[in-house]
């Protein structure tokens, strides 16, 4: 069976939107009005992995681009990157570990935990216009809570 996917945008808990910053980086900033069209649309795929009521394994691709968020070790540190893939083979039900995030729903907010690096989360900074990154702390200065807005296909 083909993998189930939906199109969505994400905003952090301070209502910052995610936009492209160069070919392989996302940044978070406040957008209004027509600028909202700059925000990236994700194709969120529901992939194979350990699942529970509040935890669902997903992969986050950029809609109509052959790019996926992935988590790898760089200089011994878990790092978030945008990785190019062969569009003929992705998305797929069995994604490589580095592409998988546990989508965790808590109090109507979403967290995206790396399946490869437990307790590391997709994060944004309090400051404007800073890169989206993989952070190893929750509840500190950095933001790990998001809301999801559905986008029609």
């Amino acid at each position: 069976a083909p993998v189930r996917s939906l199109n969505c945008t994400l905003r952090d808990s301070q209502q910052k939107s995610l936009v492209m910053s160069g070919p392989y980086e996302l940044k978070a900033l406040h957008l209004q009005g027509q600028d909202m069209e700059q925000q990236v649309v994700f194709s969120m795929s529901f992939v194979q992995g350990e699942e529970s009521n509040d935890k669902i394994p997903v992969a986050l691709g950029l809609k109509e681009k052959n790019l996926y968020l992935s988590c790898v070790l760089k200089d011994d540190k878990p790092t978030l990157q945008l990785e190019s893939v062969d569009p003929k083979n992705y998305p797929k039900k069995k994604m490589e570990k580095r592409f998988v995030f546990n989508k965790i729903e808590i109090n109507n907010k979403l967290e995206f935990e790396s399946a490869q690096f437990p307790n590391w989360y997709i994060s944004t900074s309090q400051a404007e216009n800073m890169p989206v990154f993989l952070g190893g702390t929750k509840g500190g200065q950095d933001i790990t809570d998001f809301t999801m807005q559905f986008v029609s296909s």
Epitope: V72, S84, K94, K97, R98, Q116, P118
Partner: antibody
Amino acid sequence: EVQLVESGGGLVQPGGSLRLSCAFSGFSLSTSGMGVGWIRQAPGKGLEWVSHIWWDGDESYNPSLKGRFTISKDTSRNTVYLQMNSLRAEDTAVYFCARNRYDPPWFVDWGQGTLVTVSS
Amino acid sequence: DIQMTQSPSTLSASVGDRVTITCRASQDISNYLSWYQQKPGKAPKLLIYYTSKLHSGVPSRFSGSGSGAEFTLTISSLQPEDFATYFCLQGKMLPWTFGQGTKLEIK
């Protein structure tokens, strides 16, 4: 010091089954990011990745196996298993287990291998 | 599946020579490539990972380079213990696939 030791190989008839074991020491398969894979080598041939299991139980298989093999782990016994069913002559190979950490993989430590011969 | 093609299949060289082995992928594999050395009757040993990072304990005469779909393993000055078979492995996409091997033999 990390060690991996394979066992369970031997002569089996076509259509038969065999369970290989990979007993390891020097690391824990409950450590996040840790994985153990099976790689085989037919006589005089190259290496072929067979299967892999991560610390969290996530499994991967080479699709060429057509679902005949199953990987599993017993974390408390520090052992990974490869259950091989419906064996064919082309499954004849030395089977190695090897340790890696994180994806993308590179296999840091290897066992010495166990020979599986499928023949009537 | 991603096909990995190594060249040459066999390489004859002498102690002290500089040798290069090439591994080509059928598609872009980023830098997700590792190299292994295997001697007859023994298990493979990791030499290089992430295309160019030397595994601990591996002599500095071994080096790796490349990106995308073409990669090389270089031995700057062959030692007697380097005569063996070398394999590359791509970790970009499941199923993970090896090159067919390059046998390095004494000239």
